[in-house]
């Protein structure tokens, strides 16, 4: 339904707070360097325009859509040029190329400072001077440094962050109340950046249709009792409201989730019959709770799929009549019955059945050519439960840290151009699944575990786009959406690499390693041992781990030593010589 | 507006056969799973049979099961249900409605009323 004016819709629909919260995220996901102040005063303007359109819709430049009302905005930033070279030039094309041109820019991975946290007085007398800025900076620092986050999402986790802090400022141990709480959100947040990170990716690398496919086989496992109907209905709302965010119109993504929400809420007894406690919540949770709710129960007595897909007489003409459709409804129907089985494969399923009736519907005995079909599903279908069983086995067998440890080395050999940096997070992420998943039973297993590794190669593929260095991720992460998990693990040591130069220098650790945390110390290990396989990329597993180990002894050596320094120095030096006769280099 | 027609019911002597048919329209029928279920006099509704969004999958009640035989046209946007060897306990009023296995209430037609009587 069109409005006059598209900023007092919106300003009305969602209220100021919200509206300027979501400004605010929309701003500095797209001018990731700009100072917060700056930012605060062009959301101060944006909104007090909105009011005067709020009272008059017919008042000055009220028509104009909010691309042209925010880009315009972003485009008085005096210092454009100076702190983003090349970005500067979208001010000189007109809407859509302009916001088309901003969204090109968004950096996944922008040069800016760690967050580090201050204690925890200091955060609350902050907190308490000035509640709205200091919220308004924690929406600024994380939508900078994650240009693609789901902005409703992020409001919720606002919301979140404000209570932890009403709550624990005034507890009697403020940092043990605070702290685990603000780590918890850390780590949600990450998690949430990435899996929205790969819907963006799915959208604007593989189009609508290859993210409106995940969302029928997800939403079918999850609502398995819904029609085909009500899924299909859910599934062209969902991919507006993630076109829309990933697109940078995130008041009319956040508009039209709570639209989604309700709709869900007041058609529940057709969706799933888990959705009552999450439709009892306030707006951000709701929306939220409704995103992560279990799977329902299958409904009972569902017939053969061979029966509609196979040994049905009519398979080509359905197919032909409306192949998308056709299609969407075998996903549906092997979705709601597979809650056991990753997005992913489900897709590769639909795909490999795609193929199978192109071929078959144009031989001259489509049945006979299409009567094995379920037959090709099953090597599909053993090769991740066979390569989760195998990682689970090796996770049990080493931990976390020594299981990251493995994948680090794995991927190295398969991918050493990538940044070291890179790999060391990616090799962590893809560590991560093994505390993550392999404690479910064999029923939830696969949907955790390659679903989630989807989404930290997704992270792999945005970060080596940016800079693009092996031909082999670029093809793994480009040829198919799918089969991207198997396309690496099918990746063997790259025989034409030329192993990097040795450097002292890399291998060079001083009394600061004994004051970081656990887990920075683990990164620097990991950083380490990335840099010895460049150096020595045939290195065998026996090899690296005396290295390691070796490694290990002298920081913790050096650690207790009475002059950390000079035992960092001394001691370092006969490490690398060691290490080097060791590898042979 | 959903709207679900039934008819083809009657009277029909035990052992003997019927036809029924539903034509659906206000929706995407092809979209949904089809039921059929039915409320003998003075009793509660009854699921019947169900039918797969293409019509290749079927379930069917046990006590018609072997009997009964649920199909679908979806270019015809109609749904049928042939009782053969029908017993005086299929008395009842048989209405067509949306979704597999429904056992939510959903809007029901006026229905078709079948009568096995000797």
């Known amino acids: 339904d069109a409005h006059k004016s598209e900023v007092a819709h919106r300003f009305k629909d969602l209220g100021e707070e919200n509206f300027k919260a979501l400004v605010l995220i929309a701003f500095a996901q797209y001018l990731q360097q700009c100072p917060f102040e700056d930012h605060v005063k062009l959301v101060n303007e944006v909104t007090e325009f909105a009011k005067t359109c709020v009272a008059d819709e017919s008042a000055e430049n009220c028509d104009k859509s909010l691309h042209t009302l925010f880009g315009d905005k972003l485009c008085t930033v005096a210092t454009l040029r100076e702190t983003y070279g090349e970005m500067a030039d979208c001010c000189a094309k007109q809407e859509p190329e302009r916001n088309e041109c901003f969204l090109q820019h968004k950096d996944d991975n922008p040069n800016l400072p760690r967050l580090v946290r201050p204690e925890v007085d200091v955060m609350c007398t902050a907190f308490h001077d000035n509640e709205e800025t200091f919220l308004k900076k924690y929406l600024y620092e994380i939508a900078r440094r994650h240009p693609y986050f789901y902005a409703p999402e992020l409001l919720f986790f606002a919301k979140r962050y404000k209570a932890a802090f009403t709550e624990c400022c005034q507890a009697a141990d403020k940092a043990a109340c605070l702290l685990p709480k603000l780590d918890e959100l850390r780590d949600e947040g990450k998690a949430s950046s990435a899996k929205q990170r790969l819907k963006c990716a799915s959208l604007q690398k593989f189009g609508e249709r290859a993210f409106k496919a995940w969302a029928v086989a997800r939403l079918s496992q999850r609502f398995p009792k819904a029609e085909f109907a009500e899924v299909s209905k859910l599934v062209t709302d969902l991919t507006k409201v993630h076109t829309e965010c990933c697109h940078g119109d995130l008041l009319e993504c956040a508009d039209d989730r709570a639209d989604l929400a309700k709709y869900i809420c007041e058609n529940q007894d057709s969706i799933s019959s888990k959705l009552k406690e999450c439709c009892e919540k306030p707006l951000l949770e709701k929306s939220h709770c409704i995103a992560e709710v279990e799977n329902d129960e299958m409904p009972a007595d569902l017939p053969s799929l061979a029966a509609d897909f196979v040994e049905s007489k009519d398979v080509c003409k359905n197919y032909a009549e409306a192949k998308d459709v056709f299609l969407g409804m075998f996903l549906y129907e092997y979705a709601r019955r597979h809650p056991d089985y990753s997005v992913v494969l489900l897709l590769r399923l639909a795909k490999t059945y795609e193929t199978t009736l192109e071929k078959c519907c144009a031989a001259a005995d489509p049945h006979e050519c299409y009567a094995k079909v379920f037959d090709e599903f099953k090597p599909l279908v053993e090769e991740p439960q066979n390569l989760i069983k195998q990682n689970c086995e090796l996770f049990e067998q080493l931990g976390e840290y020594k299981f990251q440890n493995a994948l680090l080395v794995r991927y190295t050999k398969k991918v050493p151009q990538v940044s070291t940096p890179t790999l060391v997070e990616v090799s962590r992420n893809l560590g991560k699944v093994g505390s993550k998943c392999c404690k479910h039973p064999e029923a939830k297993r696969m949907p955790c575990a390659e679903d989630y590794l989807s989404v930290v190669l997704n992270q792999l593929c945005v970060l080596h786009e940016k800079t693009p260095v092996s031909d082999r991720v670029t093809k793994c992460c480009t040829e198919s959406l799918v089969n991207r998990r198997p396309c690496f693990s099918a990746l063997e040591v790259d025989e034409t690499y030329v192993p990097k130069e040795f450097n002292a220098e890399t291998f060079t650790f001083h009394a600061d390693i004994c004051t970081l945390s656990e887990k920075e110390r683990q990164i620097k290990k990991q950083t380490a041992l990335v840099e010895l396989v460049k150096h020595k990329p045939k290195a065998t597993k026996e090899q690296l781990k005396a290295v390691m180990d070796d490694f290990a002894a002298f920081v913790e050596k050096c650690c207790k030593a009475d002059d950390k320094e000079t035992c960092f120095a001394e001691e370092g030096k006969k490490l690398v010589a060691a290490s080097q006769a060791a590898l042979g280099l | 507006e959903v709207q679900l027609q039934e008819s083809g019911g009657g009277l029909v002597e035990p052992g003997g056969s019927l036809r029924l048919s539903c034509v659906a329209s206000?929706?995407?029928?092809?979209?949904?799973?089809m039921s059929w279920v039915r409320q003998a006099p003075g009793k509660g509704l009854e699921w019947v049979s169900s039918i797969s969004l293409v019509g290749g999958g079927t379930s069917y009640a046990d006590s018609v099961k072997g009997r009964f035989t649920m199909s679908r046209d979806n270019a015809k946007n109609t749904l049928y249900l042939q009782l053969n060897s029908l017993k005086s306990e299929d008395t009842a009023m048989y209405y067509c409605?949306?979704?597999?296995?429904?056992?939510?209430?959903?809007?029901l037609g006026q229905g078709t009323l079948v009568t096995v009587s000797s």
């Open positions: 206000g929706f995407t029928f092809q979209h949904y799973a």
């Open positions: 409605v949306r979704g597999w296995h429904p056992d939510v209430p959903r809007p």
